[in-house]
Interface confidence: medium
């Protein structure tokens, strides 16, 4: 028979062969054969591997330090990471929770929407147009693009979410 | 190196006042936001005020507002905390931080004992 260019699902295709991808929770150690299986194995301790894979090494859990005001919410399993969270009173810097601070900062092009509180972290919001905000702070909101036309200016450049407009004297016309 | 170093603190009455510093160093000052928060012995941190870079915006926690004020001298790269009325339950160790990361940079802080 012709040999298969593509596999089911849960198959890879290898030496013009299917063989059955490890299950979530075991790594590769050899592919199947005309006469034998793929051979898989579990994953050691502190490892993991979440999907039907062909990987030969598992991965590590992440590592919640303390150091860095980390602890375990969740502990892994063979087939999960570890998930961390932060010390009460501290948020997560981002989803992957790789750092914590006391609160937020918004960054250029975000303002404040609602400031922090012992127990809610900062609230952040994109400058709507017309508005901007240059820097990162935890407390600022986006601030009004400048009127050039109540200075008796015109607008030389645009503003964006992240800088003000840049405002500059009329052109007079000549006689 | 990022060093920031706080001064002033000591013992003082209820109802006094304390003028906290923290001189800065290693970093640009006037382009970041300054925090104060402190640490009440047995409790957590919890944040008291923070500046702009530019001085012109000031943030207080409600426990301190118009008792305590903060201020900037970019010139000098120094911090204030003027506190006013001080309470027993003032009595912290506080500390100047350039930005509110856990491992971020903090000063070693300095002791602020309210009591009669």
């Known amino acids: 028979p012709e040999p298969p260019t593509a596999c089911r699902e849960k198959q890879y295709l290898i030496n013009s062969q299917c063989c059955s991808l490890c299950q979530p929770g075991q790594k590769l150690v050899s592919d199947c054969t005309e006469f034998t299986e793929t051979e898989c194995l579990p994953c050691g301790e502190s490892e993991f591997l979440d999907t039907w894979n062909r990987e030969t090494h598992c991965h590590q859990h992440k590592y919640c330090d303390p150091n860095l005001g980390l602890r375990v919410q969740q502990k892994g399993t063979s087939e999960t990471d570890t998930i961390c969270t932060c010390e009460e009173g501290w948020h997560c810097t981002s989803e992957a929770c790789e750092s914590c601070v006391l609160h937020r900062s918004c960054s250029p092009g975000f303002g404040v929407k609602q400031i922090a509180t012992g127990v809610s972290d900062t609230i952040c919001e994109p400058c709507p147009v017309g508005f901007f905000s240059n820097v990162s702070s935890a407390f600022e909101k986006c601030h009004p693009w400048t009127s050039c036309e109540t200075k008796d200016l015109v607008v030389q450049q645009a503003g964006t979410n992240k800088t003000d407009v840049v405002c500059g004297p009329q052109d007079r016309l000549r006689a | 190196e990022v060093q920031l170093l706080e001064s002033g603190g000591g013992l003082v009455q209820p109802g006094g006042s304390l003028r906290l510093s923290c001189a800065a160093s290693?970093?640009?000052?006037?382009?970041?936001?300054m925090q104060w928060v402190r640490r009440a012995p047995g409790k957590g941190l919890e944040w008291v005020s923070a500046i702009s870079g530019d001085g012109y915006r000031t943030y207080y926690a409600d426990s301190v507002k118009g008792r305590f004020t903060i201020s900037r001298d970019n010139s000098k790269n120094t911090l204030y905390l003027q506190m006013n009325s001080l309470r027993a339950e003032d009595t912290a160790v506080y500390y100047c931080a350039k930005e509110l990361l856990y491992f971020d940079y903090w000063g070693r802080g300095t002791l602020v004992t309210v009591s009669s």
């Open positions: 290693g970093f640009t000052f006037e382009w970041y936001e």
